[in-house]
């Protein structure tokens, strides 16, 4: 076909961002481009074209008409991570291509199961007590909190001290005894630990 | 189309080595784990390993350590299974299969027979 | 490693029969369970993943259930095409159950 002079290449008028979501849930990385005849946008994550619904009407990838990218549910396993990686789009017509920034998906994830759960713990009136759990692996890195008889430990008592997966108190007063539970949180949601049962006994 | 295509049967000596291959298409290769199956004649499945085709990385059960081999070559998509030492009880259909990232394996070839006999 | 244990090992029904098959972990592994179907001569094919959620173009007459470690794959009416071996996989550590033979009554 013979140039006509009103053509121009492509050109990005809008890149993609970086995005963290969490599994499941949708996501778009965003890609807009400018060219005459109007460009084809195609993505790439990794060096590797990224197949969409046009494709396979079974992807879970659609390619919009604006040429974004949306994912209608994060997947993202124990192993395999189809979706995480860094993505760019290409958008191409007879006179050249153009390529957006590269654009990171990173995945936010929060396992179900605790790599250690709080045990038992016996202690007489006025001796420290101490409770610890591992959360299960989450990204981001899961916060810690804790939580007594189903209610929000109260931190701002100076006997407490919560660091990493331990929960310190420093001297036991008999009404510290109860049902503890550790909570791990971050974007995904949060797990609660198995129960772990704080006895304090009189002297 | 998504798909796994597997080389074809195989008739092996005891003692020999067996290399199956399993091409893939229609996804992105380096995406998904991919696993080997094997299943003896009028038996369960059992699984034998994986191989990250990103990386190259592999896990096998205990039981097949020192014998089976799992590589790629991501220039054709294809992931490679070998097992050597040969036993008359290695006789069975092997099959590899993608792991989705719903942790299943949602795409299977469609199974490679290997008899072992002398 | 985990082991699953699969029970019954083989069962007799008739069409329109509601089937239930269970499938046992050695120890908790969440809702990392899936069930596949097999006919004769053909590679597995993946009914449910995570327990409980149905594969793409899977029949809704198949569902599952189960965490930690009791499990169940439930067929509400079992069609001509639904007598196969069908099979229970942990997704942790990726090992089988022993399979479950569905017969013609």
């Known amino acids: 076909s013979r140039l006509r002079q009103e053509d121009f290449p492509p050109r990005i008028v809008e890149h993609p961002s970086d995005l963290i979501v969490s599994k499941g849930e949708p996501a778009t990385l965003n890609c807009k481009a400018e060219g005459r005849p109007t460009p084809t946008i195609e993505w790439y994550k990794g060096g590797e074209r990224v197949e969409t619904d046009k494709d396979d009407p079974r992807s879970h990838r659609m390619l919009l008409p604006s040429g974004s990218l949306f994912f209608l549910r994060i997947v993202h396993g124990r192993r395999s991570k189809p979706d995480e990686g860094v993505y760019v789009c290409v958008a191409r017509n007879y006179l050249g291509e153009a390529v957006s920034h590269n654009a990171s998906l990173e995945v936010a994830i929060l396992r179900d199961d605790f790599r250690q759960n709080p045990s038992d713990v016996m202690v007489a009136v006025g001796e420290p007590a101490v409770m610890e759990c591992q959360p299960p692996r989450g990204h981001p890195e899961p916060t810690i909190s804790w939580k007594k008889d189903g209610s929000p430990l109260d931190d701002k008592d100076e006997r407490i001290t919560i660091r990493g997966g331990k929960l310190m108190i420093t001297y036991t007063r008999k009404s510290d005894a109860g049902k503890y539970v550790c909570v791990g949180t971050n974007m995904v949601g949060e797990r609660e630990s198995e129960v772990a049962e704080l006895t304090v006994l009189e002297r | 189309e998504v798909q796994l295509v597997q080389s074809g049967a195989e008739v092996k000596k005891p003692g020999a080595s067996v290399k199956v291959s399993c091409k893939a298409s229609?996804?992105?290769?380096?995406?998904?784990?991919m696993h080997w199956v094997r299943q003896a004649p009028g038996q369960g499945l059992e699984w034998m390993g994986w191989?990250?085709?990103?990386?190259?990385?592999?896990n096998f059960p205990q039981k097949f350590q020192g014998r089976v081999t799992m590589t790629r070559d991501t220039s054709i998509t294809t992931a490679y299974m070998d097992l050597s030492r040969l036993r008359s009880d290695d006789t069975a259909v092997y099959y590899c299969?993608?792991?989705?990232?719903?942790?299943?394996?949602?795409?299977w070839g469609q199974g490679t027979m290997v008899t072992v006999s002398s | 490693d985990i082991v699953m244990t699969q029970s019954p090992s083989s069962l007799s029904a008739s069409v329109g029969d509601r089937v239930t098959i269970t499938c046992r972990a050695s120890?908790?592994?969440?809702?990392?369970l899936n069930w596949y179907q097999q006919k004769p001569g053909k590679a597995p094919k993946l009914l449910i993943y995570?327990?409980?959620s149905l594969q793409y173009g899977v029949p809704s007459r198949f569902s599952g259930s189960g965490s930690g470690t009791d499990f169940t794959l439930t067929i509400s009416s079992l069609q001509p095409e639904d007598f196969a071996t069908y099979y229970c996989?942990?997704?942790?550590?990726?090992?089988f159950g022993g399979g479950t033979k569905v017969e013609i009554k």
């Open positions: 299969a993608r792991e989705s990232g719903d942790d299943a394996f949602d795409i």
């Open positions: 229609g996804y992105t290769f380096t995406g998904y784990y």
């Open positions: 191989i990250n085709p990103k990386s190259g990385a592999t």
């Open positions: 120890q908790k592994i969440s809702s990392y």
């Open positions: 995570a327990a409980s």
């Open positions: 996989q942990q997704s942790v550590g990726l090992f």
